[in-house]
Amino acid sequence: SGTTNTVAAYNLTWKSTNFKTILEWEPKPVNQVYTVQISTKSGDWKSKCFYTTDTECDLTDEIVKDVNQTYLARVFSYPAGNVESTGSAGEPLYENSPEFTPYLETNLGQPTIQSFEQVGTKVNVTVEDERTLVRRNNTFLSLRDVFGKDLIYTLYYWKSSSSGKKTAKTNTNEFLIDVDKGENYCFSVQAVIPSRTVNRKSTDSPVECMGQEKGEFRE
């Protein structure tokens, strides 16, 4: 059913990392265009990506208004060149997305080790606090600003000369670990939100090692 020669969107999928959020769908349009609407549970639908031939729509600006809300999007299909046409139910053909709660579901982006500094047998490792597109008082918030203590980092570290890994955890962006004097260590970090049921962990950061070109002091 629906408008002649118009097919409903399908495989509506949220792609979201550090709150940068894009809705993707199929199929690639043939003689049709799409418009996306997004709403919280309030049912106040807002239209985005009007009459597009793309099969994705950046909804970041909408979801960052309140990352704790649950959102639903719907993709309307219209015949190209006749966007006033409606389906048999008196409205354009559309399909709904799965629900999406940014705070609970956005993927954690790959973290970056900002710096490490050795003082004696202690090494301070600092994780870069990545900026998100979530705003408060006209300022972009960092990942830590948004998640607070819900976000922890796990540090994996090992002697360059061996493969045995140790771990440490922090609910700040800094680690202070004990190391053996005279040994070089390699580090990798992972962002984790333990309270989550999905998308709990980021991918591991690139490995950084002491005594390499980048040095032990980096801003």
Epitope: S1, S39, T40, K41, S42, G43, D44, A89, G90, N96
Partner: antibody, heavy 118, light 106 residues
């Protein structure tokens, strides 16, 4: 606890008017679409109207379009249904319901009875 | 408008029975279907939304399935508290309810 309490029902003559109210508590009222559903005596459920959280979007069943007006006052956590030009077939129990996205009803009030009769 | 047809209209069953109620839509509604339970003199209660998602607090003996035009509500083992009338509701295009299925004691 999420609660909805309807009021304003009663006996009214054909052609008359009535305003139903629904007082909401236990949730952030403006965060949800709300709706009215009715049930005639011994009959099934019939959707009447839905309003978005801001009040900016309203939807009506064909059977009440032009006669009924849904509205809300978010400062008072209250939903309304203004019913004009009432007919005998509008006789029913009217339920207020919380309606995420305006799609399905996850919390219902106990209902208020409207009887249209001369 | 999308019409919703429930069958059977009345179903006689005993405690412990497995009960299945069917709801058919006049056109495809994808998975945009809810199921409600209503007891005499009481308000309806949401059981299932999005065809198969169990509402919080609803016993796991209730389950929903289907997509497109054909849907089922299943009660795996009927309990005394389950004798009631059940309604399906589509929300693909506005809102329409099925006519109801009364589950009564055999």
């Amino acid at each position: 606890e999420v609660q909805l309490l309807e009021s304003g029902g009663g006996l009214v003559q054909p052609g008359g008017s009535l305003r139903l109210s629904c007082a909401a508590s236990g949730f952030t009222f403006s965060d949800y679409a709300m709706g009215w559903v009715r049930q005639a005596p011994g009959k099934g459920l019939e959707w009447v109207s839905t309003i978005s959280g801001s009040g900016g979007l309203t939807y009506y069943a064909d059977s009440v379009k032009g006669r009924f007006t849904i509205s809300r006052d978010n400062s008072k956590n209250t939903l309304y249904l203004q019913m004009n030009s009432l007919r005998a077939e509008d006789t029913a129990v009217y339920y207020c319901a919380k309606a995420p996205y305006g799609y399905y009803m996850d919390v219902w009030g106990k209902g208020t009875t409207v009887t249209v009769s001369s | 408008d999308i019409q919703m047809t429930q069958s059977p209209s009345t179903l006689s069953a005993s405690v412990g029975d497995r009960v299945t109620i069917t709801c058919r839509a006049s056109q495809s509604i994808s998975s945009w279907l809810a199921w409600y339970q209503q007891k005499p003199g009481k308000a309806p209660k949401l059981l299932i939304y999005k065809a198969s998602s169990l509402e919080s607090g609803v016993p796991s003996r209730f389950s929903g399935s289907g997509s497109g035009t054909e849907f089922t509500l299943t009660i795996s083992s009927l309990q005394p508290d389950d004798f009631a009338t059940y309604y399906c509701q589509q929300y693909k295009s506005y809102i329409t309810f099925g006519g109801g299925t009364k589950v009564e004691i055999k």
